[in-house]
Interface confidence: low
């Protein structure tokens, strides 16, 4: 007899893991045999969909490899034309071990800002997300919170927040760990100890200290009156993210010294500045009746000739005394390239000490001229032949300018060291072996116009430039 369909095994809820097999059973009793159709969320499942297997006359529906999107309500409907169609429904709950879909990444953040380390997860049941810092579980507090999304938010990031982090996603089916990521906290450059201002006497040595910190460790540069410091020695040490810089100065003029600490954050820089003034007791700028001022030699041409950190007289009749006097020497030196090896060092010493005269500091800085005896030693012993040629060229107007006349002193007008030993400057570089005088070029006269002082003998067999000997 015809019998309307009856579902003897109603559908149940099926739990399945992603990629597992999931089967619904819809056992039907009827006569004639019913047609059974299946729907998912009220949409008909097509018989030829290869993701499904429909067997036992449609009573078994198997999902061959469960996917996330298979979650939903599945219904079977049986109809054999006798009576009405019958339906049974059940849910597929796709269970999924935790999966971290957006893992955290390494973060560099500036102290005080907000950091967010992402950790987006998938899983069913929904995974709970916790974080590990180093090897310990991370505790939440007023600054640190795990968001609903699983991301870690840190307000007002502190140095101690730096470290290695990973997120852990956990549900009843398993646990997923992210890879370890690094949170690096960068700190703006900050000056911990500013240089102190000083009021000192002319010619004093002063050390300016500047200590700074930051992450990364900053670099320290010193500025003198708006320009990079050109003289003085800088010593630096770094310990525990603190840099200590010491600038040692020989004070010949007042100035504003600025310590600048700089560090880099990505493409941007942060800087911190601190300044100190150096004033000189009883200092007055060169007056109009002052012809110049004393300063350390900062040029290049006379570096080998003048004593290290030599105090030289800079003539303020030039707009830029240092540059003008350096140019004078430079121009004159070019002429010396062709002179004899005996003459050249002596002439260089004379030129440098004549153009950059030793300076006597004081309320009125005073240049100290070269002693006449040293001038004559160069003129009549070392460079006799060359001197004649040069004077002749000068008188015949062969030089391009008057510069060379300025470069060569008139020996006869210079003070003698026998009058007042402190009134003139000696040339410590002149040193020759008296026994080798016969090798020098012939003199212009049978004897020098003035007694040439005895120079100490040295072991060298020819003229040499040496700062260790002086004429006494």
């Amino acid at each position: 007899l015809p019998k309307a369909p009856v579902i003897t095994t109603p559908l149940e809820t099926v739990d399945a893991l992603v990629e597992e097999v999931a089967t619904f059973m819809c056992a039907v009793e009827s006569y004639p045999q019913p047609e059974i159709s299946w729907t998912r969320n009220k949409i008909l499942i097509k018989l030829f969909d290869t993701r499904y297997s429909i067997r036992e006359n449609g009573q078994l529906l198997t999902i061959l490899s469960v996917e996330d999107s298979d979650d939903g309500i599945y219904c079977c409907t049986a109809n054999n034309g006798v009576g009405g169609a019958v339906e049974s429904c059940g849910a597929l709950q796709v269970k999924m071990k935790p999966k971290i879909t957006r893992p955290p990444i390494n973060v560099k953040i500036i102290e005080g800002l907000k950091a967010v380390l992402p950790c987006t997860t998938m899983g069913n049941p929904k995974p709970s997300v916790s974080w590990i810092k180093g090897d310990s579980p991370l505790r939440e507090n007023s600054r640190i919170a795990v968001l609903e999304s699983g991301s870690l938010r840190i307000h007002n990031v502190q140095k101690e927040d730096a470290g290695q982090y990973r997120c852990v996603a956990k549900n009843s089916l398993g646990t997923a760990y992210s890879k370890v990521v690094k949170l690096e906290v960068e700190v703006f450059a900050r000056i911990l100890r500013a240089p102190e201002s000083h009021n000192v006497t002319f010619g004093s040595f002063v050390t300016l200290h500047c200590t700074a910190t930051g992450i990364p460790v900053p670099t320290i540069t010193w500025i003198e009156n708006g320009n990079a410091v050109s003289s003085g020695s800088i010593q630096e040490s770094v310990k525990d993210r603190v840099i200590d810089s010491r600038l040692q100065l020989f004070i010949t003029k007042p100035g504003l010294y600025t310590c600048i600490a700089t560090n880099k954050h990505g493409e941007k820089f942060s800087t911190a500045k601190a300044a100190a003034t150096i004033s000189i007791a009883e200092w007055s700028k060169p007056q109009k009746d002052n012809k110049g001022y004393c300063a350390q030699y900062r040029g290049e041409v006379c570096n080998a000739v003048l004593a290290k950190d030599a105090l030289v007289f800079l003539n303020t009749s030039y707009a830029d005394p240092e540059e003008a006097q350096e140019l004078l020497v430079h121009t004159a030196w070019n002429e010396l390239k062709v002179v004899s090896p005996v003459c050249r060092p002596a002439a260089e010493a004379l030129l440098c000490n004549h153009i950059f005269q030793e300076c006597s500091p004081g309320v009125v800085p005073t240049p100290i001229p070269i002693c006449r005896e040293y001038c004559l030693a160069v003129k009549e012993l070392f460079c006799a032949k060359e001197w004649l040629v040069m004077e002749e060229k000068t008188h015949r107007g062969l030089y391009r300018s008057e510069m060379h006349l300025l470069s060569v002193p008139e020996c006869s007008k210079l003070p003698s060291m026998h009058w007042d030993p402190t009134a003139c400057a000696r040339l410590p570089h002149l040193d020759y072996n008296k026994e080798n005088l016969k090798t020098f070029p012939p003199m212009t006269s049978s004897k020098p116009s003035v007694d040439i002082p005895n120079l100490p003998s040295s072991s060298s067999s020819s003229f040499s430039v040496s700062p260790t000997y002086s004429m006494t």
Partner: antibody, heavy 121, light 107 residues
């Protein structure tokens, strides 16, 4: 047939270094997590280190962190353990093991025969 | 790190006996526990994974159970080849740890 063969063990002085190798065959090496487990003479098993299938994660036991380095070369089907600053307590048979992911965590379904490392002066 | 404490550390039994070895984790480890057998001079062999799943090729007299923190390995009827040392292992944490082992000896 899955095979894991360790090599590189031997006698080394304290403070010295040694590099262990594990040659894998019979399975798709690049699909599996690999681990090192050691066993001191007469003692129990101690997990040493683990490396993800493509080297994306690495873990070490506290006792070896900073001294040992695990690495792998998927092209050569090889796992390595570089051991530096060796101590007497590192003396053990070192096994490499294949990690198999299941519904609940990882288990070691295949093990090598082990290689003996002796640290002694 | 998660500690795994096995008990007893040694056990004497006879062929045919039912033997139970327990393992306790210092924190919940879900079902992330595996059991291994090791014979002298040999590499360990996987018996049970995911707390209760029998590894392919392992005799059915071996079974595992438990969830959370307490786990057991049971040998229903001891055979001569079963005398060995047994280890539990947790894989809940990426820093895996083993129990100290249980030596099963012939009485």
């Amino acid at each position: 047939e899955v095979q894991l063969v360790e090599s590189g063990g031997g006698l080394v002085k304290p403070g010295g270094s040694l590099r262990l190798s594990c040659a894998a065959s019979g399975f798709t090496f690049s699909s599996y997590t690999m681990d090192w487990v050691r066993q001191a003479p007469g003692k129990g098993l101690e997990w040493v280190s683990s490396i993800g299938s493509n080297g994306d994660y690495i873990y070490y036991a506290d006792s070896v962190r900073g001294r040992f380095t695990i690495s792998r070369d998927n092209a050569k089907n090889s796992l390595y353990l570089q051991m530096n600053s060796l101590r007497a307590e590192d003396t053990a048979v070192y096994y490499c093991a294949r990690g198999q992911l299941a519904v609940a965590g990882t288990h070691f379904d295949y093990w090598g025969q082990g290689t003996l490392v002796t640290v002694s002066s | 790190d998660i500690q795994m404490t096995q008990s007893p550390s040694s056990l004497s039994a006879s062929v045919g006996d039912r033997v139970t070895i327990t393992c306790r984790a210092s924190q919940k480890v879900n079902k992330y526990v595996n059991w291994y057998q090791q014979k002298p001079g040999k590499a360990p062999k996987l018996l049970i994974y995911a707390a209760s799943t029998l590894q392919s090729g392992v005799p059915s007299r071996f079974s595992g159970s438990g969830s959370g923190t307490d786990f057991t390995l049971t040998i229903s009827s001891l055979q001569p080849e079963d005398f060995a040392t047994y280890y539990c292992q947790q894989s809940y944490s990426p820093l895996s740890t083993f129990g100290q082992g249980t030596k099963l000896e012939i009485k």
